[in-house]
């Protein structure tokens, strides 16, 4: 769930890395209330995920490795 490009809450689903093309990180500030990882999916959706959850960290790590290889 997001509003004005801010994540307001986290998804309650687990996504597969095959579904994700990239991510951006949201840091809590005066505009956005929470830290979040915003996953960008192959369907053009943006999904707000909790950066503390293991499955989120795993995908971020996997995508970061891919980016570093390029």
């Amino acid at each position: 769930a997001s509003n004005f490009d801010c994540c307001l809450r986290y998804t309650d689903r687990i996504l597969h890395p095959k579904f994700i093309v990239g991510f951006t990180q949201q840091l809590a500030n005066e505009t956005c209330d929470i830290n979040a990882v915003i996953f960008h999916t192959k369907k053009g959706l943006s999904v707000c995920a909790n950066p503390k959850q293991t499955w989120v960290k795993l995908i971020v790590r996997r995508l970061s490795k891919k980016i570093n290889k390029m």
Partner: antibody
Framework: QVQLVQSGAEVKKPGASVKVSCKAS????????MHWVRQAPGQGLEWMGV????????TYAQKFQGRVTMTVDTSTSTVYMELSSLRSEDTAVYYC?????????????WGQGTLVTVSS | DIQMTQSPSSLSASVGDRVTITCGAS??????LNWYQRKPGKAPKLLIY???NLADGVPSRFSGSGSGRDYTLTISSLQPEDFATYYC?????????FGQGTKLEIK
């Protein structure tokens, strides 16, 4: 070797709750998810939900939301699945299964199953 | 939720036959699909992960193919121990829905 050992069969009355345990051994417990899947008589496999033992994160199938609770005890490498407000349709074999994100999020090892019978 | 539809729901075949089971997803699941075998009274067993990869210890007569919405499990030469029920499963996004199963029986 990897082993998932589940608790024994249960008979419950409608409206009661049941708590099934699944004790893991032979691998690093917190490195893999644990799923719960059930199979009712004459029916197919039904995914109920998953717990990540490393952070206790859970996500449940909508059908079971509010009735199922999955918990973990890392000190004993055991996962628990509690299902409340039981009805006759909950009569099934309940399986725990290790979720391995290294093999495409597949369930690569399964417990032996626990038969839960709901009957008045 | 993503729906998974298997066909046929049951199938009679003989030892040595080549058998194909299909699984269709209600939307593109990008190869995030696994296949399991279940025999009566036993726990399910992983056969294929990631649509095409053979799980450890699974005989090479089993193979998986497909992409997008359509996937196939093939047994190249049926053995007596292969008579069982087979399930596909979506793992793209929770809930991880299963197909309704295909029961493979001896002709």
């Amino acid at each position: 070797q990897v082993q998932l050992v589940q608790s024994g069969a249960e008979v419950k009355k409608p409206g009661a709750s049941v708590k099934v345990s699944c004790k893991a051994s032979g691998y690093t417990f917190t490195n893999y998810w644990m799923h719960w899947v059930r199979q009712a008589p004459g029916q197919g496999l039904e995914w109920m939900g998953v717990i990540d033992p490393s952070d206790s994160y859970t996500t449940y199938a909508q059908k079971f939301q509010g009735r199922v609770t999955m918990t973990v005890d890392t000190s004993t490498s055991t996962v628990y699945m509690e299902l409340s407000s039981l009805r006759s349709e909950d009569t099934a074999v309940y399986y725990c299964a290790r979720g391995n994100y290294g093999v495409d999020y597949a369930m690569d090892y399964w417990g032996q199953g626990t038969l839960v019978t709901v009957s008045s | 939720d993503i729906q998974m539809t298997q066909s046929p729901s049951s199938l009679s075949a003989s030892v040595g036959d080549r058998v194909t089971i299909t699984c269709g997803a209600s939307e593109n699941i990008y190869g995030a699909l696994n296949w399991y075998q279940r025999k009566p009274g036993k726990a399910p067993k992983l056969l294929i992960y990631g649509a095409t990869n053979l799980a450890d210890g699974v005989p090479s007569r089993f193979s998986g193919s497909g992409s997008g919405r359509d996937y196939t499990l093939t047994i190249s030469s049926l053995q007596p121990e292969d008579f069982a029920t087979y399930y596909c499963q979506n793992v793209l996004i929770t809930p991880y829905t299963f197909g309704q199963g295909t029961k493979l029986e001896i002709k």
